[in-house]
Structure formats: structure tokens, C-alpha cells
Interface confidence: low
Amino acid sequence: MEEGGDFDNYYGADNQSECEYTDWKSSGALIPAIYMLVFLLGTTGNGLVLWTVFRSSREKRRSADIFIASLAVADLTFVVTLPLWATYTYRDYDWPFGTFSCKLSSYLIFVNMYASVFCLTGLSFDRYLAIVRPVANARLRLRVSGAVATAVLWVLAALLAMPVMVFRTTGDLENTTKVQCYMDYSMVATVSSDWAWEVGLGVSSTTVGFVVPFTIMLTCYFFIAQTIAGHFRKERIEGLRKRRRLLSIIVVLVVTFALCWMPYHLVKTLYMLGSLLHWPCDFDLFLMNVFPYCTCISYVNSCLNPFLYAFFDPRFRQACTSMLCCGQSRCAGTSHSSSGEKSASYSSGHSQGPGPNMGKGGEQMHEKSIPYSQETLVVD
């Protein structure tokens, strides 16, 4: 699945011929249970994000909203396949759903991975433009640019994930009782180049889907943090409070992304390096055994974003509250305004910010107040 990782069976490395591999110790119901939990939370949470973004009026949407919506769509399209993967895992890796669903659901995993990462990179760059270069790059951040960038990222994600659609298949590789959903390079690779394809696709996937975007994100947040720190040095006590909160959000965004995806990419890379570096058998076996859990952690990322919004963004909480109690008369009047406020919390367009000198919660702000301080910087 990941899958690979998701990748085909590998026979080549000499070091592996000496390793005593045991039959896969199934995680039992743990991974399937997590998948189902991610499915439930992910569909609800990402559905809620889409609902709050799209129910706000067009004028109130900003350039960042399109990335947030895309992120939710990417996560949502992926999490709906999780019941299939939960079943596959629970059945001890026996795929009963046919070849097309194997191809499609595997494809969606990687489309989600690329689209999510690109959305986060887009949001990070959008934040960078908004905070570090708010005036010079105002034109770059128009809604049209956001739409074009989103279209590009989706096309890119769809193309980069295409090898999975091409090579994934179902087959009974070793016995007659279980059908696996796996990568089959035999149509393009000889025996000797099988591993080269696996390594090539694996390394390029990690580079394009993690290393490069993560480097861009870190660079963006480095300059953002630098700018915020510079501005806040000029602020008084209220500014110090905001500095702590804004910087903590930035740290949480980067750390959450890294925590969820780093184990997957790290273990995958180490496993592939094994053919060159000849890891000790115990370490090689450890990598193989830990990989499903790394995959599981990376999938959890698809349901975390809404919780991060809810935890760090009071306006998103308001929007959720307004939806939850919109049927009650006492909330009915606040429903629309709350979602409008929420829209602003995701926004990044300072060309049409709220009323003069009004910050979060309607606080009066200092004359010297930086233009982005009315916004929450939650981007993941």
C-alpha cells in the first residue's frame, strides 16, 4: 500500500539472504482500528473544514482558503479509502476488492501525500508573502493566483502519483490463499533492474514529496519567525503574548508535519539504503517490522489538520460551535457571522483586511501593529 510504500517484493541484496526473516507478525486489530478511527475523524473533521470554508461568502475568502480547502479535499479523498486498507490489514494482507480498487486506493494515498504536502508548502509560501513581503507581493496573492497554484499542485500531485496507478496490481505472489495489492515492475523492469525501479521511485517520492517541500516550509517559517520576532520587539506586553502564540503555532505546524511523515520517509529510505550499506539483520528486520506503524502514523496526519485548526484557531472553533448549535434558537443569530469570522481566520489577504486597527476579538491595536496580527497562522 504505501505505500510504498508501497513497493514490489525484493530479492536482490546479498545481506538479506543471510537474514532470518520471520513470517510477518500481524498487528492484529491495532492498525485496522487506527485506520477506522482516522476514517471517522478524517471524514468528519475535513468535511467540517470544507463546510466552514465554502459556506462563507466569496468576498470574504482569501488566497489561503483555497489551499485549506484543497488540503481538506486531499485528506477527505484519501480517508474514504481507509476502510479498504483496514480490511486488508485485518485480513492479514489479503485484498478482496479487485485490481481496480487496489490501483485507485493506492493512487489516492500518493495523490493525498503529494497534494497535502504541496498545499502546506503553498500555505507556507502564502504566509511568507503575507508576513515577510506583504506589500511587494500583494499582487501575487490574489485569488486567481491561488486558484492557478492549486490547479498546478493538483495536476502535479496526480502526475507524480501516476506510477502507482500504472504499477499497482493484485496478485497471488506466493500461495493460493491470499491476494496482495502490490507494485509490479515486471512490465518495465528486468530482474536486475527491479530494485533500481523500486529505489528510483522511492527516492524520488521522498525527495519530491517530503525533502523539498519540507525545506521550503522550514525556509518560509524561518523568515516568518524572524519577521515576527523583529516586529514583536517593538511591541509591548500584548505583543509578547501574541508572539508566543504565533510562534508556537508555527512550531506546531512544522513539528506535526515532520512527526507524521518523517518516520515513513526515514524508514523507507533506510530500508532502501540497506542494499548498499548492508545493515545488520536485526536492524533490517526492525525496519521491515516498524514500517506499517510508520505508514499508520503518516495516515493519521489526514485527520489531524481540523484538530489543529480547532485547537489553535478560536475563529474556527466559533464556526464549529455555530454549526453544532445552528439548530437552536439561541445560536441561530450568530451562525452566519461566526463562519464569516472563521473565514478571516484562514485568510491571508491583507489587501482587504478587517476594519482599521481592529485585531482578533475586536481588540484595539496599536498604531504600530503589524498588518498580519489580526490573523491566525494555522496552515496545517
Epitope: 510504500g5 530479492y11 530500508y271 514500517f291
Partner: antibody, heavy 129, light 107 residues
Framework: EVQLVESGGGLVQPGGSLRLSCAAS?????NYWMSWVRLAPGKGLEW???????????YYVGSVKGRFTISRGDAKNSLYLQMNSLRAEDTAVYYC??????????????????????WGQGTTVTVSS | DIQMTQSPSSLSASVGDRVTITCRAS??????LGWYQQKPGKAPKRLIY???SLQSGVPSRFSGSGSGTEFTLTISSLQPEDFATYYC?????????FGQGTKVEIK
């Protein structure tokens, strides 16, 4: 030292039964699939049967299905082949062999197969009246 | 069942010769094939697994190649201890099947 030692062979009449044993040492027996392979006089090697670690999967060549049963006793590090309704064509040297399997981490479940890497010296079964 | 056809069934060669044995599967078996060496009265010994991967401890003069239906075992320079019978084994599907064997004799 990794070692497999077969026993239980002998002379048996057609229609009779025999139970072959294979004692394993030098490796974690419960971690491996195990196989039986035979070599009939003047013929080539023939794979007979194999069994998964926990006994949940067993496979047989068509000519022995319903007559032979492969089993294992992990506590005794032993592999067994119960042979019933023996025929003259079952006459052969029977080898037990260790099967090497692993998993591709990235497909989590796709088994790759190394083949039979450790063999015993064999035990002779003669079916004759 | 997948039939494995080995050729030649026997061959005579001298020490230092390059020897090639082929194995043909009745249907595609990817690279799910191994090569085994057996000497009279001895247990078989695995030389190659997965069509081309050399078993640890086996001299590098042995090599395997092929994928799909055509496979080859090559001994680059025949040594006295290499005179034996060689078998290919497919493990792509059950029942596993061996080739009929190739006996390599001294010329």
C-alpha cells in the same frame, strides 16, 4: 550449527503407512516454513509438501493429496510427514528442508521467497511387497 | 501445474569449460526460480535464488539470469567439484515443480 535430521524411513508394503520425522536444530524452528522433497530412484527431485510456521497453511503436490499429511511440533522442533495408502511410486529418499520467506516492508504482506536453503541428509522410504 | 523443462538433460565438459544450463517454464513465473546442485548420496544445495541472486557461500563462478519463462544457470569455469546434477525449481505457484535435472559429467 543449522541442522536437519530425518528419521522414520524404512520398508513398507503397498497400502501401508509410515511417519517421517525431521528434527531441527541451530535455528528458531518456529520462525520458518518447512518442506518435504523427495528423490525417486532414477528420477529427479519432486517437491512434496510444505507448512507455514503456525500450521495454518499447508500445500501438497497432487499425487500425494489426501494420502500424506504434513505437520509440525514446535515444542520438539520437529517436522512430520504422515504417509498413508503408500504406493510403489512413493519409493524415494525423503528430505526435509527449511523454507526461507520474508516480507517486503512497503507492501506489508507481499511474501518473497528465498527457496529451500537448508536440507537434511534424507531418509529412505521403500514401498514394496 | 507449471512444467519446468530443463536442457540439456546431460552434458560432458572439461575442467575450465563454460557451462550453460537452461530452464524453460510453461508459463511466466517472474523471477520466482532457484537453482540447486545435488551430488550422489548427498542433500541438494541451493546455488541461486530469485533467478539471479547468488546464495551466500556459493562461488561467484555460478550465476543465474532470466525472467518470465526463460532462465539460465552459467558456470563460468567448471571446477572438479562442480560435477553433479543441477535442478531448477519454480516457486511461483503451487505445486512447486523442479526441472527434470541436468547431469554434468567429466568429458
Amino acid at each position: 550449527e543449522v541442522q536437519l535430521v530425518e528419521s522414520g524411513g524404512g520398508l513398507v508394503q503397498p497400502g501401508g503407512s509410515l511417519r517421517l520425522s525431521c528434527a531441527a536444530s541451530g535455528f528458531t524452528f518456529s520462525n520458518y516454513w518447512m518442506s518435504w522433497v523427495r528423490l525417486a530412484p532414477g528420477k529427479g527431485l519432486e517437491w512434496v509438501a510444505n507448512i507455514k510456521q503456525d500450521g495454518s497453511e499447508r500445500y501438497y503436490v497432487g499425487s500425494v493429496k489426501g494420502r500424506f499429511t504434513i505437520s509440525r511440533g514446535d515444542a520438539k522442533n520437529s517436522l512430520y510427514l504422515q504417509m498413508n495408502s503408500l504406493r510403489a511410486e512413493d519409493t524415494a529418499v525423503y528430505y526435509c528442508a527449511r523454507d526461507r520467506f520474508g516480507y517486503s516492508a512497503f507492501d506489508k504482506g507481499v511474501r518473497y521467497y528465498y527457496g529451500m536453503d537448508v536440507w537434511g541428509q534424507g531418509t529412505t522410504v521403500t514401498v514394496s511387497s | 501445474d507449471i512444467q519446468m523443462t530443463q536442457s540439456p538433460s546431460s552434458l560432458s565438459a572439461s575442467v575450465g569449460d563454460r557451462v550453460t544450463i537452461t530452464c524453460r517454464a510453461s508459463q511466466g513465473i517472474r523471477n520466482d526460480l532457484g537453482w540447486y546442485q545435488q551430488k550422489p548420496g548427498k542433500a541438494p544445495k541451493r546455488l541461486i535464488y530469485a533467478a539471479s541472486s547468488l546464495q551466500s557461500g556459493v562461488p561467484s563462478r555460478f550465476s543465474g539470469s532470466g525472467s518470465g519463462t526463460e532462465f539460465t544457470l552459467t558456470i563460468s569455469s567448471l571446477q572438479p567439484e562442480d560435477f553433479a546434477t543441477y535442478y531448477c525449481l519454480q516457486h511461483n505457484s503451487y505445486p512447486r515443480t523442479f526441472g527434470q535435472g541436468t547431469k554434468v559429467e567429466i568429458k
